[in-house]
């Protein structure tokens, strides 16, 4: 994501639009104690990292409060006083968003329609997968607001879900994440289910008469 | 389609003002930072001023400081640059650009003129 | 702020040719250069960014290459549409800096 600079591998996450995190990568720095100094004013002096991260005993990342910032993050990664990656980056271009908060499944016959608590800022997708241990494979289907109808399921199928959120490309550019998943919940008939059968249960045979 | 359409441009004394506007549509407006850049007559491209999308964060040349200012009407998907204190070096089309992330300055409006001269 | 050079200043080749231009930083600037391509009277138009990535829509006989300072936009096969003047720009660090640009001509 960041390239390489002098051998620095570089990644930005903007967790949520609360919580910024550099992370570097730096072989040729492997056993260095590296600094990490910013700024979100290209007029203001550098700020040192009170917040480190670190990798086997040795600095590897930094932790900033940025609370709905979308501006620039200007930041210069030091070996002593020399500067070993210096740049600046639009931080909302790396938006992870949170994932999804109070799921809900609201059943109507062969339809569920899933709901969560919309995030407080928008141009996101809410993506919902969900399989049934039929399938090989995970169906997924998204909307703009955390209120997503899938139809056309089989009551008698238990089916597993999962919910998560993502930036929009158009809007946010190529370098967001999606939010990690929530947890899986399992659904039959209408009802929670603590797990789905891994091997589909084969049909009951019909009594003949 | 992305598209930037500047205007405001024209002829003004030096020491004069200028408001510059660029409407923008075809994508989210308000959630892309955005870019002025001018190209002196003959001469290369010049990185003028930007501003976030939310109009929170601004940045300016240290050519302009003092005297541009960057704004954005977000519900009017609309950008601004009002110069003041314009001098004959100032002369230049000035392109309205949005911010693509790490895709760089990926849309250009086509541009409007500015000259300034007695 | 980081200075962007490119050479040549201008070059003349015909069609068919394969062209090179290059673009060094005064500093590291990682893969953060782009290159646009201005006809006359136009606007710059991107053709690559992050050093290697071709915007969308961009034919592929474009190519970008380079990491840290030294940076290359090959051009495979030159078309008349072709004849430009080509701009590299850095955006890993603000303010963000263009070369002078290279003029390409028919020979």
């Known amino acids: 994501q960041g390239g390489a600079a002098e051998g620095v591998q570089i990644q930005i996450i903007y967790f949520n639009l609360e919580t910024v995190q550099v992370t570097w990568n730096a072989s040729k720095y492997s056993r260095t104690n590296l600094t990490f100094h910013y700024r979100f004013n290209g007029d203001e002096a550098y700020d040192q990292c009170t917040n480190y991260l670190l990798q086997e005993g040795h600095t590897s990342g930094c932790l900033l409060d940025a609370e709905q910032r979308d501006d620039i993050l200007y930041f210069s990664i030091r070996n002593g006083t020399h500067p070993v990656f210096t740049a600046s980056r639009w931080m909302v271009y790396y938006l992870k968003p949170s994932s999804p908060k109070h799921v809900r499944f609201s059943w109507h016959q062969d339809a569920v329609t899933v709901t969560c608590s919309d995030l407080s800022y928008g141009d996101l997708l809410y993506e919902v997968q969900y399989r049934s241990p039929f399938d090989t494979e995970w169906q997924s289907k998204q909307e703009n607001t955390c209120n997503v109808t899938i139809e056309g399921l089989d009551a008698e199928k238990c089916y597993s879900f999962w919910v998560r959120v993502k930036a929009m490309e158009d809007v946010y550019g190529p370098d967001t994440y999606p939010s990690d998943w929530s947890e899986v919940t399992c659904w039959q008939r209408g009802e929670i289910r603590d797990a789905c059968a891994e091997t589909p249960t084969p049909p009951k045979p019909k009594l003949s008469k | 389609e992305v598209q930037l359409l500047e205007s405001g441009g024209g002829l003004v004394q030096p020491g004069g003002s200028l408001r510059l506007s660029c409407a923008a549509s075809?994508?989210?407006?308000?959630?892309?930072?955005m870019h002025w850049v001018r190209q002196a007559p003959g001469k290369g491209l010049k990185w003028v001023s930007s501003?976030?999308?939310?109009?929170?964060?601004?940045y300016y040349a240290d050519s302009v400081k003092g005297r541009f200012t960057i704004s954005r009407d977000n519900p009017k998907n609309t950008l601004y640059l009002q110069m003041n204190s314009l001098r004959a070096e100032d002369t230049a089309v000035y392109y309205c650009?949005?911010?693509?992330?790490?895709?760089?300055?990926?849309?250009w409006g086509q541009g409007t003129l500015v000259t300034v001269s007695s | 702020d980081i200075q962007m050079t490119q050479s040549p200043s201008s070059l003349s080749a015909s069609v068919g040719d394969r062209v090179t231009i290059t673009c060094r930083a005064s500093?590291?600037?990682?893969?953060?250069l782009a290159w646009f391509q201005q006809k006359p009277g136009k606007a710059p138009k991107s053709l690559i960014y992050?050093?290697?990535s071709l915007q969308s829509g961009v034919p592929s006989k474009f190519s970008g290459s380079g990491s840290g300072t030294d940076f290359t936009l090959t051009i495979s096969s030159l078309q008349p549409e072709d004849f430009a003047t080509y701009y590299c720009?850095?955006?890993?660090?603000?303010?963000?800096?263009f070369g002078q640009g290279t003029k390409v001509e028919i020979k």
């Open positions: 650009v949005k911010e693509g992330g790490s895709r760089g300055f990926d849309y």
């Open positions: 075809g994508f989210t407006f308000r959630s892309s930072a």
């Open positions: 501003v976030s999308g939310s109009g929170a964060g601004t």
């Open positions: 500093q590291d600037i990682s893969n953060y």
């Open positions: 992050t050093a290697s």
């Open positions: 720009q850095q955006y890993n660090l603000y303010p963000p800096t």
